[in-house]
């Protein structure tokens, strides 16, 4: 292991479409990949009227978006399918959504709403 970095060897596995895909429904997935590459865990889910439905969880291949992330956090604003990735064994057991507010510079004078 590289100092200060948690290597990912296994992740929580889940597949909502397990019957169609002929896989297990839940379990632990050992992560394989080229030995020169980093490995991560991921989680995908949907928010159906406030109810969280997990789509898939498992291993994710070398991705700089996941480097040094110990927590699985989706930061994209209102995606159709939520996705997060992280480093460290079973780090995808818990996942969360914290949208990153994009700070955009106004290109012209900001419009002040008229009082009612």
């Amino acid at each position: 292991a590289i100092l200060g970095r948690s290597e990912t060897q296994e992740c929580i596995f889940y597949n909502a479409n397990w019957e169609r895909d002929r896989t297990n429904r839940t379990g632990v997935e050992p992560c394989y990949g080229d030995k020169d590459k980093r490995r991560h865990c991921f989680a995908t889910w949907k928010n159906i009227s406030g109810s969280i439905e997990i789509v898939k969880q498992g291993c994710w291949l070398d991705d700089i978006n996941c480097y040094d992330r110990t927590d699985c956090i989706e930061k994209k604003d209102s995606p159709e399918v939520y996705f997060c990735c992280c480093e460290g064994n079973m780090c995808n057991e818990r996942f969360s959504y914290f949208p990153e507010m994009e700070v955009t510079q106004p290109t012209s004078n900001p419009v002040t709403p008229k009082p009612p």
């Epitope: 590459k37 291949l61 991705d63």
Partner: antibody, heavy 115, light 111 residues
């Protein structure tokens, strides 16, 4: 071993669309991205876009925005790239590649646009 | 999303070393270790030679090395061999919040 096998060569008329497929094997398809890259005859590589194979989330190069659609069918481990409103300048070899690092490539699909 | 800049061509004799540069901006090459190098022989698909600035995929000879200084990444090939004659492209990681971009390519001639 990891393999990406692409569909065969296509000849298309200007204004029409083409859909190229890329079937992945030798790894878990839903564990990475699939990128699409094209190369016109005698020219360099040009990135077109990417898809997260598990979430379906896509990003496209500005140049192709509105004209390219990348999709993934997880049940067959196949990614697709559809390019519409074809013109002669779209004549190129189209490649799919695995992951953000483009570590494995398909064999390429020649798309010829000619009237 | 503008292309990275590479020299059109470089050349060297067998046994010599050559370096190919790839210049971008502080928001692409300069911002993170996410530059890749690919080798392409005529009529073939590109082959990854270096990724993440300096990481070498297994199977790639250690004659190939990558580095970065500021907004410029470099590929150095030492002990040139005839089979190294090819086109070389730099490119960035693409996926998630990162958009891909390639250099224009450099033709390496082994004299």
């Amino acid at each position: 071993q990891v393999q990406l096998v692409q569909s065969g060569a296509e000849v298309k008329k200007p204004g029409s669309s083409v859909k190229v497929s890329c079937k992945a094997s030798g790894y878990t398809f839903t564990s990475s991205y699939i990128n699409w890259v094209r190369q016109a005859p005698g020219q360099g590589l040009e990135w077109m876009g990417t898809i997260n194979a598990v979430s379906g989330s896509t990003s496209y190069a500005q140049k192709f925005q509105g004209r390219v659609t990348i999709t993934a069918d997880t049940s067959t481990s196949t990614a697709y790239m559809e390019l519409s409103s074809l013109r002669s300048e779209d004549t190129a070899v189209y490649y799919c590649a695995r992951g953000g690092w483009f570590d494995y490539w398909g064999q390429g699909t020649l798309v010829t646009v000619s009237s | 999303q503008s292309a990275l800049t590479q020299p059109r061509s470089v050349s060297g004799s067998p046994g010599q070393s050559v370096t190919i540069s790839c210049t971008g901006t502080s928001s692409d090459v300069g911002s993170a270790n996410y530059v890749n190098w690919y080798q392409q022989h005529p009529g073939k698909a590109p082959k990854p030679m270096i990724y993440g600035v300096s990481r070498r995929p297994s199977g790639v000879p250690d004659r190939f090395s990558g580095s970065k200084s500021g907004n410029t990444a470099s590929l150095t090939i030492s002990g040139l061999q005839a089979e190294d004659e090819a086109d070389y492209y730099c490119g960035t990681f693409a996926g998630g919040k990162y958009y891909g971009v390639f250099g224009g390519g450099t033709k390496l001639t082994v004299l």
